[in-house]
């Protein structure tokens, strides 16, 4: 899915209002220094691509994030604010239903969610490229100029 046409500000608002709190709950009891952030993103569509991948794609040692509250709210936000996103996710949803039902918080999952927090932080506050004296542009965000 191409996240270029999402309403980034609405997704950011959803994250700050609810998703971030669910991530904190998931990570409660974990020290911020425990994991090194190795996943990064360069612009807002890229950040959403990485966020989707880490949130919904099962990985070795962490197969259960898609059923977490933050994941469900992330999916809802993307479905609402990214045109056509829902249609692309039908197959993924079916695969999710076949996945294990039990929620197991492994150390690998905690590390993955720590990476997610870094990706969301980057998504929310991309540094703006400057053009001229007062015209700011972010290559990834042509339709949403006030993206802070």
């Amino acid at each position: 899915y191409d996240f270029t046409n999402c309403d980034f500000e609405k997704i950011k608002a959803a994250y700050l209002s609810t998703i971030s709190k669910d991530l904190i709950t998931y990570m409660s009891g974990t020290k911020s220094t425990e994991f090194n952030n190795t996943v990064s993103c360069s612009n807002r569509p890229h950040c959403l691509t990485e966020i989707q991948s880490l949130t919904f794609n099962p990985t070795a040692g962490c197969a259960s994030l898609a059923k977490e509250m933050f994941a469900m709210k992330t999916k809802a936000a993307l479905a609402i604010w990214c045109p056509g996103y829902s249609e692309t996710q039908i197959n993924a949803t079916q695969a999710m239903k076949k996945a294990r039902k039990s929620k197991v918080t492994t150390n690998k999952c905690l590390e993955q969610v720590s990476q997610l927090q870094g990706l969301w932080r980057r998504f929310n506050r991309p540094l703006l490229k400057q053009q001229g004296s007062s015209d700011y542009k972010d290559d990834d965000d042509k339709h949403h100029h006030h993206h802070h």
């Epitope: 209002s17 220094t33 932080r121 929310n124 540094l127 703006l128 802070h148």
Partner: antibody, heavy 120, light 111 residues
Framework: EVQLVQSGAEVKKPGSSVKVSCKAS????????MHWVRQAPGQGLEWIGA????????SYNQKFKDRATLTVDKSTRTAYMELSSLRSEDTAVYYC?????????????WGQGTTVTVSS | EIVLTQSPATLSLSPGERATLSCRAS??????????MHWYQQKPGQAPRLLIY???NLGSGIPARFSGSGSGTDFTLTISSLEPEDFAVYYC?????????FGQGTKLEIK
């Protein structure tokens, strides 16, 4: 506990350059925007610019765009702010500040400040 | 750029009194229902300290006597009952539109 420790006070001649360092300890370094803010004696706070350590991307206040250079050294978890062509009006306390955990755009951790005096 | 105007420039009050500080933006700092306005306290010789983020949320470790309100262009920082340690300079800051800007500050002094 995240801490930002800045380099010591500097006295510089007009026309020269100064490079201030800001070393981060604790927490994650690479995924937090790092900002630089200055405060002239008896004056308010003025934003200079910001850098994202993950890839070195920068954003500058237009006022400082031609004279300020922000860099980072991820291996030592240190951010740098270099200001060139110094003039007396650049006499100020320079602060580094880390942006918050969520990307809300506030500064929750500040360095102790570095006093830069520009005098002939 | 967004200009933040704080008033009054100086506020003289006594401990125990209520303090109301204002910050007005030259254009809205709201985005998708959120107000990206933050408040800091600064004492002489110290770095600023975050008090309120996103208009009304209390920063970590900040006493409940501090509160923030407002949206759009008009914001208020209130200290319900002044303690001796509250006398300092207060700054508002917006992050909705680059460049990031601060207000010129309000000095809260003992009457």
């Amino acid at each position: 506990e995240v801490q930002l420790v800045q380099s010591g006070a500097e006295v510089k001649k007009p026309g020269s350059s100064v490079k201030v360092s800001c070393k981060a300890s604790g927490g994650t370094f690479s995924t937090y925007n790092m900002h630089w803010v200055r405060q002239a004696p008896g004056q308010g706070l003025e934003w200079i610019g910001a850098i994202y350590p993950g890839n070195g991307e920068t954003s500058y206040n237009q006022k400082f765009k031609d004279r300020a250079t922000l860099t980072v050294d991820k291996s030592t978890r240190t951010a740098y702010m270099e200001l060139s062509s110094l003039r007396s009006e650049d006499t100020a306390v320079y602060y580094c500040a880390r942006e918050d955990d969520y990307g809300e755009g506030y500064f929750d951790v500040w360095g102790q400040g570095t006093t830069v005096t520009v005098s002939s | 750029e967004i200009v933040l105007t704080q008033s009054p420039a100086t506020l003289s009050l006594s401990p125990g009194e209520r303090a109301t500080l204002s910050c007005r933006a030259s254009e809205s700092v709201d985005n998708s229902g959120l107000s990206f306005m933050h408040w800091y306290q600064q004492k002489p010789g110290q770095a600023p300290r975050l008090l309120i983020y996103r208009a009304s949320n209390l920063g970590s470790g900040i006493p409940a006597r501090f509160s923030g309100s407002g949206s759009g262009t008009d914001f208020t920082l209130t200290i319900s009952s002044l303690e001796p340690e509250d006398f300092a300079v207060y700054y508002c800051q917006q992050i909705n539109t680059d460049p990031l800007t601060f207000g010129q500050g309000t000095k809260l002094e003992i009457k």
